[in-house]
Interface confidence: medium
């Protein structure tokens, strides 16, 4: 729960970028360009970089905790390095001309500081016990206290990352992860389901049978209903997840020849905001005490949207929050799903927790038989997936949508790409159904636009 | 251009209600997380509540908690927030924000109304 992190999930990142040699932006003038120093470090030894104004030299790296100061003067001379100062860092051996900026843990975010910054480690930022963390973004966490689960039990109990699943006793709904008394259910509600037999007897016994019998009979006879339709969906279910075994598993790879030289044009990141231009109130939050935190998530059939993938305007966006989009694609619509995924290898396109449009394209072209053996190759466990569809009750669509939406959260954003999902569809034979993905999420103009995305 | 306009505040008193309506524009308003700010005279900003896009979360403070209750309304491009059992402390202007995205590294927000004055007095 309250365990440690970098704030902003700097320090992986950072470890990556000192040892691939990218930088961050204030020390990007000050080093050369990527695609070249890759290619002269790779001249020198591990341990080593070459000289930038001699190549034949090949100077000692820098220890984590110092930076570059000037490079060693000839072949087996020293580098001069220079410890960090006070309020930076550097985590691992390097050829940096600045130390990184140490981070601050977000007080007005509830966080708080586990371990401070010192030369060669970046501050460590967590939350109180009894807390978990709830990402807006990416990089930007919020401390919230666990759910107690009164007037009910502990399904999973809280975690680092993930408020505890409460199922209410009897007499109780659960709202906003709380479980609350059924006195309190108002028929407008979702509650009504679960608070039935409660309602009813609320109206008083001295109602004759049938008005208690009549609401019965027609719950149950909607149940049989919905059954049956659920019947002949997954008879429909089977008979699509046949034909995409045969259309998408199949078509697509005996055309892979055929677009060779097609070129397909990537996926833009979508460009930060700038802040508003009119009203900026005062910088940063006044700090609010942690304890003053306080989550509440319900998960109820009503919230369940139109899944169709939305089509995106200017600049769509958890979210992760977990929960929010990031990445606007390129509009036109792109031939060969088997090019452009192979092609993005080399330049991986982050797919973004809070793009739904994505998300939900995925969702709605896997085949759903397909679907537990899709999110298992992606790394979550029977257990995650789950926790997901409990969390999510009826409404199996988000409960999918949560599964890609956890598996993005946790994975590196390098690596949570396009071409990773490409690559797991291929091995499920399924690659033929990327093309479908595609038409969902930039598809022909000829497509209708879509619903709105909640009720 | 993104604009996010706040109304609904007014003077009440202690025990009473008001409702907050947010209502936005320049932007693809159900796919953003939204939220609530706000400020009271002389202090900082305090964070009050939160709602993903698909308006299934919902998170507060614990100075409000059981007493607002923010939804939305993606149809109509609306935020709002119910302000039941308001108390002399509740006294603030509020501001509806639209959360910042995954590439944002900086604040929780990267738009905000204009704010509505919300008086809770006697």
């Known amino acids: 729960m309250g365990l440690s992190t970098v704030p902003d999930l700097l320090l992986p990142l950072v470890l990556l970028e000192l040892l691939v040699g990218i930088y961050p932006s204030g020390v990007i003038g000050l080093v050369p360009h990527l695609g070249d120093r890759e290619k002269r470090d790779s001249v020198c030894p591990q341990g080593k970089y070459i000289h930038p104004q001699n190549n034949s030299i090949c100077c000692t790296k820098c220890h984590k905790g110092t930076y570059l100061y000037n490079d060693c003067p000839g072949p087996g001379q020293d580098t001069d390095c220079r410890e960090c100062e006070s309020g930076s860092f550097t985590a691992s051996e390097n050829h940096l001309r600045h130390c990184l900026s140490c981070s601050k843990c977000r007080k007005e975010m509830g966080q708080v500081e586990i371990s401070s910054c010192t030369v060669d480690r970046d501050t460590v930022c967590g939350c109180r016990k009894n807390q978990y963390r709830h990402y807006w973004s990416e990089n930007l966490f919020q401390c919230f206290n666990c759910s107690l689960c009164l007037n009910g039990t502990v399904h999973l109990s809280c975690q680092e990352k993930q408020n505890t699943v409460c199922t209410c006793h009897a007499g109780f709904f659960l709202r906003e992860n709380e479980c609350v008394s059924c006195s309190n259910c108002k028929k407008s509600l979702e509650c009504t389901k679960l608070c039935l037999p409660q309602i009813e007897n609320v109206k008083g016994t001295e109602d004759s049978g049938t008005t208690v019998l009549l609401p019965l009979v027609i719950f149950f006879g909607l149940c049989l209903l919905s059954l049956l339709f659920i019947g002949l969906m997954y008879r429909y279910q089977r008979w699509k997840s046949k034909l995409y075994s045969i259309v998408c598993g199949k078509s697509t790879p005996e055309k892979e020849g055929e677009l060779e030289g097609t070129t397909t044009k990537p996926l833009a990141p979508n460009p930060s905001f700038s802040p508003t231009p009119g009203f900026t109130p005062t910088l940063g939050f006044s700090p609010v005490p942690s304890s003053t935190f306080t989550s509440s998530s319900t998960y109820t059939p009503g919230d369940c949207p139109n899944f169709a993938a939305p089509r995106r305007e200017v600049a769509p966006p958890y979210q992760g929050a977990d929960p929010i989009l990031a990445t606007a694609l390129a509009s036109d619509p792109i031939p060969n799903p088997l090019q452009k995924w192979e092609d993005s290898a080399h330049k991986p396109q982050s797919l973004d927790t809070d793009d739904p449009a994505t998300l939900y394209a995925v969702v709605e072209n896997v085949p759903p038989l397909r679907w537990k053996e899709f999110v298992r190759r992606l790394g979550l466990s029977d257990h995650e997936i789950d926790r997901l569809e409990l969390q999510n009750g009826r409404c199996l669509r988000e409960a999918q949508y949560s599964m890609l939406a956890t598996w993005r959260r946790r994975t590196p954003r390098r690596e949570a790409t396009l071409e990773l999902l490409g690559r797991v569809l291929r091995d499920m034979d399924l690659l033929g159904c990327l093309e479908d993905i595609e038409e969902a999420l930039c598809g022909p103009a000829a497509l209708p636009p879509a619903p709105s995305l909640l009720r | 251009e993104v604009q996010l306009l706040e109304s609904g505040g007014g003077l009440v008193q202690p025990g009473g209600s008001l409702r907050l309506s947010c209502a936005a524009s320049?932007?693809?308003?159900?796919?953003?997380?939204m939220g609530w700010v706000r400020q009271a005279p002389g202090k900082g900003l305090e964070w009050v509540s939160s709602?993903?896009?698909?308006?299934?979360?919902?998170y507060y403070a614990d100075s409000v908690k059981g007493r607002f209750t923010i939804s939305r309304d993606n149809s109509k491009n609306t935020l709002y927030l119910q302000m039941n059992s308001l108390r002399a402390e509740d006294t603030a202007v509020y501001y509806c924000?639209?959360?910042?995205?995954?590439?944002?590294?900086?604040?929780?927000?990267?738009?905000w109304g204009q704010g509505t004055l919300v008086t809770v007095s006697s």
């Open positions: 709602i993903a896009w698909l308006g299934s979360e919902t």
């Open positions: 924000a639209k959360h910042c995205k995954a590439e944002c590294t900086g604040d929780l927000f990267d738009y």
């Open positions: 320049g932007f693809t308003f159900a796919t953003y997380n």
